[in-house]
Interface confidence: low
């Protein structure tokens, strides 16, 4: 379920690279503070090639007896990434990929980057952070979006093709106006779609046809003036 | 030897308490041990009461004994309470303590349990 | 809350028979389940944590295996000494950690 009382901040880094954060300020803490560790897990859409910063519950650092970040990857082991204060000890075990890493000392700060994210990052991230008080959770179920590559021709007599080529999840197609709609998924061994539709117009006054791809990280309206002449193509890329 | 010991059956009646303690010994009582209390009534399942974090005194109780129970800790004596007030007969159960430290060894421990009778 | 339903509620089975015992979880708990065995007048004993890791010194005819909401626990090859009731228990979050309802384990 997503955790509404989160805002997702999005900064131009140097590097370039859009930088996406689910923590909070300090004031934003001691103001929702109990609903914070109320909402254990939170849905989090992400954008690949960007930089992700996961946050541990609000709890303060000195109250820590062991920080442990469980990181669950399809078709992987369990990964975790082990703090305990007493010994100022880190255990990494499962761990192979060297983008997800701490974002300074455990000790420090208990936060977890992910420079870039790739498709592979799809899965739940989980922080469990034991204190004197108890075991507080907060996890992420990461879900690493994929702009879809768009395409739009015409392929046949008052017939137009509209592309979403790998994206992830899946774009939806729609048409203005409505013709005799087919479309198709093909799925991708690396977790992205790419949806086709394929409509006929019969109606001869209509000349100009819009498709419309809606994706998560984004809309996008593409138009064709559709030729009477067979075969002809026109990208509208 | 580690182990909870608890105190002794208790009969009471109804609208009454009662306290149960649970009594740590062989291992250090301290901060990252919660100590939970569960209760199991006559021929039925396990049910789980709340528990209190050792070095805190911080607490959790299920939703069902809300504002009805009470838990407590004697670090001097390593000893855990749990109160339970406006007893009814459906209270009549055997009371558990358990230790948990943490999602590393959950659980791992048990009292041998305190048989508590509600009756009129 | 997270709820927990355990199934079956009874099993009659012979000995060196495999017994399986299945506990689902209303909502995710990755892999924060426990798997209790208790007989009767005594308290439960911890078999399993974290869905599949054996607790100390319980035999390894006893296993566990799930994640997320459907876990599983298997006795191969049952003895007499196994008759009891079993209970798997969310461990989650620490706000919260019920016990499924029980399934009785008896020997023909």
């Known amino acids: 379920q997503p955790n509404n009382s989160l805002m997702l901040q999005t900064s131009k880094e140097n590097h370039a690279l859009a930088s996406s954060s689910l923590c909070m300020d300090e004031k934003q803490i001691t103001q929702n503070y109990s609903k914070v560790l109320a909402e254990v897990n939170t849905s989090w859409p992400v954008k690949m090639a960007t930089n992700a910063v996961l946050c541990c519950p609000p709890i303060a650092l000195r109250n820590l007896i062991i920080i442990t970040w469980e990181i669950i990857l399809r078709g992987q082991p369990s990964c975790t990434k082990a703090y305990r204060k007493e010994t100022n000890e880190t255990k990494e075990t499962n761990c192979t990929d060297e983008r997800i890493t701490w974002v300074s000392r455990p000790d420090q700060n208990s936060d977890l980057q992910i420079r870039p994210v790739a498709i592979t990052h799809d899965g739940y991230y989980r922080c469990i952070m034991v204190t004197p008080d108890g075991n507080f959770h907060r996890g992420y179920h990461l879900q690493v979006l994929v702009t879809p590559e768009l395409t739009l021709f015409q392929n046949r007599n008052r017939t137009a093709v509209c592309k979403a080529v790998a994206g992830k999840p899946a774009a939806q197609i729609s048409w203005i106006p409505e013709g005799d709609c087919a479309t198709k998924q093909e799925y991708w061994s690396n977790g992205t779609v790419t949806v086709k539709s394929t409509c006929h117009w019969e109606v001869h006054n209509v000349s100009t046809v819009t498709c419309h791809v809606s994706h998560l990280t984004g809309n996008k309206s593409l138009y064709i003036e559709l030729l009477p002449v067979p075969g002809a193509k026109k990208s509208a890329k | 030897q580690v182990q909870l010991v608890q105190s002794g059956a208790e009969v009471k009646k109804p609208g009454a308490s009662v306290k149960v303690s649970c009594k740590a010994s062989g291992f250090s009582f301290s901060s990252g041990y919660y100590m939970a209390w569960v209760r199991q009534a006559p021929g039925q399942g396990l049910e789980w009461m709340g528990l209190i974090g050792v070095g805190s005194g911080s607490l959790w109780y299920a939703q069902k004994f809300q504002g009805r129970v009470t838990m407590t800790r004697d670090t001097s004596t390593s000893t855990v309470y749990m109160e339970l007030s406006s007893l009814r007969s459906e209270d009549t159960a055997v009371y558990y303590c358990?230790?948990?430290?943490?999602?590393?060894?959950?659980?791992?421990?048990w009292g041998q349990g305190t048989l508590v009778t509600v009756s009129s | 809350e997270i709820v927990l339903t355990q199934s079956p509620d009874f099993q009659s089975v012979t000995p060196k028979e495999k017994v399986t015992i299945t506990c689902q979880a209303s909502e995710s708990i990755d892999s924060y389940l426990l798997w209790y065995q208790q007989k009767p007048d005594q308290s439960p004993k911890l078999l399993i944590k974290?869905?599949?890791t054996l607790a100390s010194g319980v035999p390894s005819r006893f296993s566990g295996s799930g994640s997320g909401t459907d876990f599983t626990l298997t006795i191969n090859s049952l003895e007499a000494e196994d008759a009891a009731t079993y209970y798997c228990?969310?461990?989650?979050?620490?706000?919260?950690?019920?016990f499924g309802g029980g399934t009785k384990v008896e020997i023909k």
């Open positions: 974290q869905a599949s």
């Open positions: 358990a230790r948990h430290f943490a999602l590393s060894d959950p659980f791992n421990l």
């Open positions: 228990q969310n461990y989650y979050d620490i706000s919260s950690n019920d």
